[in-house]
């Protein structure tokens, strides 16, 4: 039975050209996290964090995506095209798969109120 819940950073807006941390946190389960996948709104994989093999950033995003902190992901040099939904998929044993969703809105610098770096526990 899947007892866990995914907490996310929540939906966020950030400045064009800035950076933002996307994070998910799995709680209320003792299941072992074997892999975390990060996907973009078009379902293309940004990065994978495997418990044994570590991080793999997909080539198309190598220049703008940094691993961490923790199991999170840092998106850098944001463009308007980065606006959209991002998915964290936690593969766990024995529970199975958990999924979190974060919507990122990238704004022109004159509109954006905040572009902070913060991580949830």
């Amino acid at each position: 039975m899947m007892t866990g819940t995914i907490e996310t950073t929540g939906n966020i807006s950030a400045k064009k050209g800035g950076s933002v941390i996307l994070q998910c946190h799995l709680s209320s389960t003792m299941a072992q996290v074997t892999q975390v996948n990060w996907e973009q709104h078009d379902h293309s994989l940004l990065a994978i964090r495997n418990a044994e093999l570590g991080w793999h950033i997909y080539p198309a995003f190598k220049d703008r995506v940094a691993p961490g902190p923790g199991l999170g992901l840092t998106l850098q040099s944001l463009t308007m095209n980065d606006t959209g939904e991002y998915f964290c998929t936690y593969h766990t044993y024995p529970d199975g798969t958990y999924r979190g969703r974060i919507f990122l809105e990238v704004l022109e610098s004159s509109v954006a109120e905040h572009s902070a770096r913060f991580q949830i526990p």
Epitope: T8, T9, G10, F103, L107, A112
Partner: antibody
Framework: EVQLQQSGPELVKPGASMKISCKAS????????MNWVKQSHGKNLEWIGL????????SYNQKFEGKATLTVDKSSSTAYMELLSLTSEDSAVYYC????????????WGQGTSVTVSS | DVVVTQTPLSLPVSFGDQVSISCRSS???????????LSWFLHKPGQSPQLIMY???NRFSGVPDRFSGSGSGTDFTLKISTIKPEDLGMYYC?????????FGGGTKLEIK
């Protein structure tokens, strides 16, 4: 003046599909997210999802995945919502509503499109 | 999904009254930047919903200052200081912090 003009009321048969349009004017269409909202029985409001005119992206309420398909036509500043395999549960008023930059809410709403599913 | 609960369901008023509508969410609406995406709408019969407040306490353009919004975390309030005829209708709160966005069930502001 910001305006969202939706297509007219529809009476459709169960099992059919239909498309609602929402033509935007008075602002730069690609600069703002477009949301879609369902109102059933004159009361409950439900967020269906949103379109991102700038890059064609979408985000859906999982409840409506497979039921609604959101698209945009940048050349005509029009957002569309196609409703698939309609049943009586889909009878409702549907609204398009522009997103407020940076606040995850809606500022301007279309006039609504009434959809009645009946044989 | 985040569950948003509004109270009361119905609020009978007299013109000139001050009223409060409550909106509670099943989890915190504060994102990792410390921002809270909670808005309020008024829906009058035969019209489209209209935005009243966004970001908890920002009045939308043209909304009179008798409307005020407050709250944090999971508990939020819309106050109307002096009820006028044009204030009657259904009030809804909306959380936009978590996917999917979710509305409260509504509060009907009506004459006693």
């Amino acid at each position: 003046e910001v305006q969202l003009q939706q297509s007219g009321p529809e009476l459709v048969k169960p099992g059919a599909s239909m498309k609602i349009s929402c033509k935007a004017s008075g602002y730069s269409f690609t600069d703002y997210i477009m949301n879609w909202v369902k109102q059933s029985h004159g009361k409950n409001l439900e967020w269906i999802g949103l379109s991102i005119p700038y890059n064609g992206g979408t985000s859906y309420n999982q409840k409506f995945e497979g039921k609604a398909t959101l698209t945009v036509d940048k050349s005509s500043s029009t957002a569309y919502m196609e409703l698939l395999s309609l049943t009586s549960e889909d009878s409702a008023v549907y609204y398009c509503a522009r997103g407020i930059k940076g606040y995850f809410a809606m500022d301007y709403w279309g006039q609504g499109t009434s959809v009645t599913v009946s044989s | 999904d985040v569950v948003v609960t509004q109270t009361p369901l119905s609020l009978p008023v007299s013109f000139g009254d001050q009223v409060s509508i409550s909106c509670r969410s099943s989890q915190s609406l504060v994102n990792s930047f410390g921002k809270t995406y909670l808005s309020w709408f008024l829906h009058k019969p035969g019209q489209s919903p209209q935005l009243i407040m966004y970001g908890v306490s920002n009045r939308f353009s043209g909304v009179p200052d008798r409307f005020s919004g407050s709250g944090s975390g999971t508990d939020f309030t819309l106050k109307i200081s002096t009820i006028k005829p044009e204030d009657l209708g259904m009030y809804y709160c909306l959380q936009g912090t978590h996917q999917p966005w979710t509305f409260g069930g509504g509060t009907k502001l009506e004459i006693k």
